[in-house]
Structures are given as C-alpha cells and as structure tokens.
C-alpha cells in the first residue's frame, strides 16, 4: 500500500487501530463529472437481457433506499423479440459499502457494512455440463 | 419516511441537524447471505458484452481499490464469436457510496461521497435516430 | 393479509372485448408483478400474461395479439382486457401475485396468492 | 409451448398412507447457472383458487405442512405426501415457471377411497 505521511490538522483519536470508529461527515459530495451524460436510464429495456428495478428500503440503512435489478427471463431476448433459451441472462452484481445504525435507531452512529446488490442483467453463453 | 424512535443508548452528538458528522465503525460486517451463491466471476468473459475490469486505486478514498469495468467492443458478440455492430456494449453504471479523507491524508476523519462505477456491459439494441 | 378480488362482467358476447379489473391489498404494488391465469369449466390452468412492478408486460403467445395488462397504481388495481373473444374465451379468470424473493436477481413467475377467480361466459 | 404431463390424472387415496404424483417437462427445467429447476407445485381445493405448495422443485412455501416435498432434475419431478390427511383433496398441478409462456400440467385429482 501507499503510505501517506498524517496531516498535523487531522482531528484527534484515541485509537488509531484497525477495526476503528471515525468521524464522517455525511455532506455527500457529489464527484459524477460524467462526460457521458445519459446514463443507465433505459438499457434496462433495450437490453437482450431486459431486468426491473425493485425498490429496497430499509430506514436502518444508509443509504435507506437500494434499488435491486432481477432478470425478466432466464434467456435472453433475440432478434425478433423473443426468449432465446440457447442463450442465459444472469444478474450483474456488486459489492457496495452502506452504513448501518449501531446501536439500532442512532441517529448518528453506524457501522459500515457491505452489501452483494444486483445492478442489471448481461446475456452470457451457457456453461455446458458435459455427462460423464 | 418512517420515523424510527431513538434509542436511548446512542452515543451523544452535538449537532443533530444534516449535513452532520457522525461515528462509524469501519469493522465492515458482511451481510452477503446470498440465495445465488454463483457470483458474476466469469460473467465479464462469457457475456455478448464482453469488458475488462481496471483497477482504480486511490489511498485518499475507503474503498482504496474499485474495480472499473470497460466494454470491449462498441458491438455486442454474435452466435459465430463476431462483433455484430448492429447492436451495442454499454455499460451499467451505478452511483456508490466511499469514504474520501478529509481533511487529506487523515486515518480518522472522512467526508461521504458519491461516485459513479461502471459495474459491467449489456447489449443493447441500439436507438435509431430517424434523419427528417 | 394479501388479498386479490377479481371483478368484471359474468357474460360477455362474441366478438366483444372482456374486461376485468383486480384489486390488490396487502402488499405492495412497487416490488411485486401480476398474473393473470385462466381455467376453462372442467379443464387445467393457462397463463396469460403479467405484469411487472414497472409497468412493463409480457404476454403469452397465444393471446398476444388480443390482450392488453395494465396497472392503476392510485387504486391497486390492475386490469386485463381480451378483445374478440369466443366461446373458447369462457373461463373463471384469476389473477395472482408473482412471488418476490430477497436476494434472488430473477423475476418469477409462479404464483403464492390468487384471487378467488371470476367466471366469465362468452355467448349470445 | 412446453408440455407439462401429470400421471396418474386420479389418485384415490387412504388417510395416514402416503402418495406420489409425477409431473413430466418436454424439455429440461435445469438452469445451468445456478442449477435450480424451475418446477412449482400447487393444490386447488374444491371450490377455491390454487394456492402454491412448493417452488424450485423442492422449496415449501411458507406455512405448507412438511407432509408435502418435491424432488427431481431436469424434466422428471415428483410430488410426495408423506401421510395423506382428509384436507389434501383436491387437484394438485405442476407448473413450469422457465420458459414463456409459463405453463401448467393438466391435474391430478386425489380424492379420498
């Protein structure tokens, strides 16, 4: 890893061990300087490998609302619009770090943790199991 | 929203108003119980939307390391293994929460941000955009 | 609990369009999709189509050219519509909630509640 | 479409024996990515809307007594009541939940000797 020397202006802290609790500030500081503007929006669709976004919610959480994708089919769309069975959709996921209220209903203490979700579908070849 | 009642045993804070600095417990709990215990390992090779994955490393952030998935065609893999440039890689983004180190190169002192990562590629059918 | 009501008009004639209407309570419209099955007197279970959380729709073939799904979200309910119907068309028509499972990336499509089905007869 | 095929389409039975219904798919049910059979099972009782029994072949819905359970792979799965109880009349059916359209078994009537 990269050592960083401290700077003399960091707040105090009595244990600088790791597993350690910190400060954070919660002012979400926003770096999307996307140079391509149209994101995600409507691939859900277009997609050979459609999905729907479900609304996860969870007021104990940080960010309290996750939206979770699930594959339309198990094949994936082709040409003429129909199901390809030949042919798999399977989820894309993600490990994401989310804050979790500990002790329960604390307004202002949490515990990272980390959650698998679903982000949207991509169309794979099938993994073919040869029989012995 | 649901308004939770606070738990009495919470540690104090002085300023209860949002943006807010909190206490966070960087000891990650891992909350993966996943029913699909198949994750998307393989998926970026087997996929009609095939990308590579480059690592992003940056010690100011928590997370340090995110992986950053890149489409590698700007079409989508036919049934013959070819780049089929009627239909088109995009790929799936999604807004995550990190940790930035402020002020910087502090071990205990973080501010929330929001950043966009590409988690990885579907195929699409392209938008036809009709010439008046 | 989960409730599902299927209301609608008991005759149809032919070559007119049957319309019914499901309401919902008991769960919630954003996270879970909607079938709609019928059973012909005396006979099994054919599916028709559904209704995903989004709005979007899906069809079985048969039907395809004649059916229309579509969700009233303000009133929980959700409404299926069969054009040109026939005598073939007579039925008790269910609807049914998909089942939504945490953790599981994959719509599914059978059904753990249905409502108590309404009969529609297709005649003159 | 798929063809699913149910045997027997009657079955009398004795309460407290056991029971077994088969269910047959045209084509395999197996998804090769996380090999689960897409195979559900549900009762119609006389009178009432079919309530689901069990779903992936094998996973009872909530609050089905263990009586019930289901096996199989691929295209060949069996439902079992391990004791058949007088409330289990009715007409169970398979249902293949994946390929579209999404469909049923023609029944199995299990009544009471």
């Known amino acids: 890893g990269i050592t960083i020397p401290r700077n003399p202006g960091c707040p105090n802290s009595e244990d600088k061990n790791f597993p350690r609790t910190v400060m954070v500030n919660l002012n979400i500081h926003n770096r999307n300087t996307n140079t391509n503007p149209k994101r995600s929006s409507d691939y859900y669709n277009r997609s050979t490998s459609p999905w729907n976004l479900h609304r996860n919610e969870d007021p104990e959480r940080y960010p309290s609302v996750i939206w979770e994708a699930k594959c339309r089919h198990l094949g994936c769309i082709n040409a003429d619009g129909n199901v390809d069975y030949h042919m798999n959709s399977v989820p894309i996921q993600q490990e994401i770090l989310v804050l979790r209220r500990e002790p329960p209903h604390c307004p202002n203490s949490f515990r990272l943790e980390k959650i698998l979700v679903s982000v949207g579908c991509t169309c794979v070849t099938p993994i073919v199991h040869h029989v012995a | 929203g649901i308004t939770i009642p606070r738990n009495p045993g919470c540690p104090n804070s002085e300023d209860k108003n949002f943006p807010r600095t909190v206490m966070v417990n960087l000891n990650i709990h891992n909350r993966n119980t996943n029913t699909n215990p198949k994750r998307s390992s393989d998926y970026y090779n087997r996929s009609t939307s095939p990308w590579n994955l480059h690592r992003n490393e940056d010690p100011e952030r928590y997370p340090s390391v995110i992986w950053e998935a890149k489409c590698r065609h700007l079409g989508c893999i036919n049934a013959d293994g070819n780049v089929d440039y009627h239909m088109n890689s995009v790929p799936i983004q999604q807004e995550i929460l990190v940790l930035r180190r402020e002020p910087p190169h502090c071990p205990n002192s973080f501010r929330l941000e929001k950043i966009l990562v590409s988690v990885g590629c579907t195929c699409v059918t392209p938008i036809v955009h009709h010439v008046a | 609990q989960v409730q599902l009501q299927e209301s609608g008009p008991g005759l149809v004639k032919p070559s007119e369009t049957l319309s019914l209407t499901c309401t919902v309570s008991g769960f919630s419209l954003p996270s879970h999709s909607v079938s709609w099955i019928r059973q012909p007197p005396g006979k099994g279970l054919e599916w028709i189509g559904i209704i995903w959380n989004n709005g979007g729709t899906d069809y079985n073939s048969a039907f395809k050219s004649r059916v229309t799904i579509s969700v009233d979200t303000s009133k929980n309910q959700f409404s299926l519509k069969l054009s040109s119907v026939t005598a073939a068309d007579t039925a008790v028509y269910y609807c049914?909630?998909?089942?939504?499972?945490?953790?599981?990336?994959?719509?599914?499509?059978?059904?753990?509640?249905w409502g108590q089905g309404t009969l529609v007869t297709v005649s003159s | 479409d798929i063809v699913m095929t149910q045997s027997p389409l009657s079955l009398p039975v004795t309460p407290g024996e056991p029971a077994s219904i088969s269910c047959k798919s045209s084509q395999s049910l197996l998804f090769s990515e996380n090999q689960k059979n897409y195979l559900a099972w549900y009762l119609q009782k006389p009178g009432q809307s079919p309530q689901l029994l069990i779903y992936?072949?094998?996973t009872r819905q909530s609050g089905v007594p263990d009586r019930f359970s289901g096996s199989g792979s691929g295209t060949d799965f069996t439902l079992k009541i391990s004791r058949v109880e007088a409330e289990d009349v009715g007409v169970y059916y398979c249902?293949?939940?994946?390929?579209?359209?999404?469909?049923f078994g023609q029944g199995t009537k299990v009544e009471i000797k």
């Open positions: 249902q293949q939940s994946y390929y579209t359209p999404y469909t």
């Open positions: 049914a909630r998909n089942a939504y499972i945490t953790d599981y990336y994959y719509e599914n499509y059978f059904m753990d509640a």
């Open positions: 992936w072949t094998s």
